[in-house]
């Protein structure tokens, strides 16, 4: 992978070498297994409309209240676990997208099947939306493209 | 209201030029991308350039490459489409709209009626 | 580059079901977005792949994405539902893709 030829990027792979991605990747298995068990859920229909009105007149604001309470008892360790991580990149959308493609990564091989693996990067690009945190755009979550710092 | 006008539209000669503007109000503009979209006359639509929240980065369709630049003035809260160099082909109806930011590579959230663009001699 | 194939039409009739299909290499892996365009006005956002439906949508609308196609389905169609659809898809060889957009006829 190229490396970023930017100020910041010693100061991002210290985050990531940091920061422990496990819960996340935990978090996401736990989630589409258990939506493989539930005879798969409709991506178009989650429990969370990030559209609604009470949030923001056309789309929530990335600083209002989470949706994901981090205090809230349903929430599972895991992904409470990984919201902190994930927060540390709230500020450089370049490095969280690194952090989601790390997390692609170090998931791919125990993946079985392409729609295993779809469902997978599906759960994985609404991460940042169920910690409450902005999602970095222009981010490549292919695990077998080469010129994939392009973010 | 939530919402993005386009102005600066109009009939220009193959070769001139052209800026567009998008003024913003409502929301808060620095966390966006925002984007430029046309739609020739009874075709379909076509992303032509974005530019990220601090203007850091910007990219383009190829096919305006070199002619076309994207800035954004965050204080104005209004982005720019400085068009240089026009072909006839270029005609169309130019939409500004933003890049929603909750989801990993969202979609275009926010539409402006969008400005009509025609060259021609 | 990225293309994003769908049907130039579709035509159904009140009350039924309307299917639009977007076909992508391996789109069920992509964030789907789609948009409804009538005629003079501006694209709107109605459905996303992966939040689903916009709060301004109502919920005859909806979709799926798996494989090498995304569906977008509008049940119960009503005379307002006329209008061009369109996919679109963020790609990193290509950008923002739009497909080129399926004209939805209610008889």
């Known amino acids: 992978r190229q490396q970023w030829e930017l100020q910041g990027d010693r100061r991002c792979q210290s985050q990531l070498e940091r920061a422990n991605l496990r819960p996340c990747e935990q978090h996401l298995m736990q989630k589409i297994q258990r939506d493989e068990d539930s005879y798969g859920r409709d991506p178009y229909s989650p429990s969370q409309d990030p559209y609604s009105p009470s949030q923001d007149p056309d789309r929530r604001d990335p600083y209002s209240p989470s949706p994901y309470d981090r205090r809230g008892a349903g929430s599972s360790q895991h992904q409470e676990r990984c919201c902190n991580e994930l927060n540390e990149f709230e500020n450089n959308q370049r490095c969280m997208c690194e952090a989601l493609q790390q997390i692609m990564e170090n998931q791919s091989d125990r993946l079985q099947g392409r729609q295993q693996e779809q469902q997978f990067k599906r759960e994985l690009r609404n991460l940042p939306q169920q910690c409450g945190l902005r999602a970095p755009q222009r981010c490549d979550l292919e695990v077998e493209s080469g010129g994939r710092d392009r973010y | 209201e939530v919402k993005v006008v386009e102005s600066g539209g109009g009939l220009v000669q193959p070769g001139g030029s052209l800026r567009l503007s998008c003024a913003a109000s409502?929301?808060?503009?620095?966390?966006?991308?925002m984007s430029w979209i046309r739609q020739a006359p009874g075709k379909g639509l076509e992303w032509v350039a974005n530019?990220?929240?601090?203007?850091?980065?910007?990219y383009y369709v190829d096919s305006v490459k070199g002619r076309f630049t994207i800035s954004r003035d965050n204080p104005k809260k209004t982005v720019y489409l400085q068009m240089n160099s026009l072909r006839v082909e270029d005609t169309a109806v130019y939409y500004c709209?933003?890049?929603?930011?909750?989801?990993?590579?969202?979609?275009?959230?926010?539409w402006g009626l969008g400005t009509m663009v025609t060259v021609s001699s | 580059s990225y293309v994003l194939t769908q049907s130039h039409s579709v035509s159904v009739a009140p009350g039924q079901t309307a299917r639009i299909t977007c076909g992508g290499e391996?789109?069920?892996?992509?964030?789907v977005h789609w948009y409804q365009q009538k005629p003079g006005q501006a694209p709107l956002l109605v459905v996303s792949?992966?939040?689903g439906r916009r709060s301004v949508t109502p919920d005859r609308f909806s979709g799926s994405n798996s494989g090498d196609t995304a569906t977008l389905i509008i049940s119960r169609v009503e005379a307002g539902d006329e209008a061009d659809y369109y996919c679109?898809?963020?790609?990193?060889?290509?950008?923002?893709?739009f497909g080129s957009g399926t004209k939805v006829t209610v008889l």
């Open positions: 792949s992966d939040t």
């Open positions: 709209a933003r890049v929603g930011t909750t989801v990993v590579n969202d979609g275009f959230d926010l």
């Open positions: 391996n789109i069920g892996g992509k964030g």
């Open positions: 530019v990220n929240g601090d203007a850091t980065e910007k």
């Open positions: 409502e929301f808060t503009f620095t966390y966006y991308w």
């Open positions: 679109q898809v963020w790609d990193p060889t290509s950008e923002y893709v």
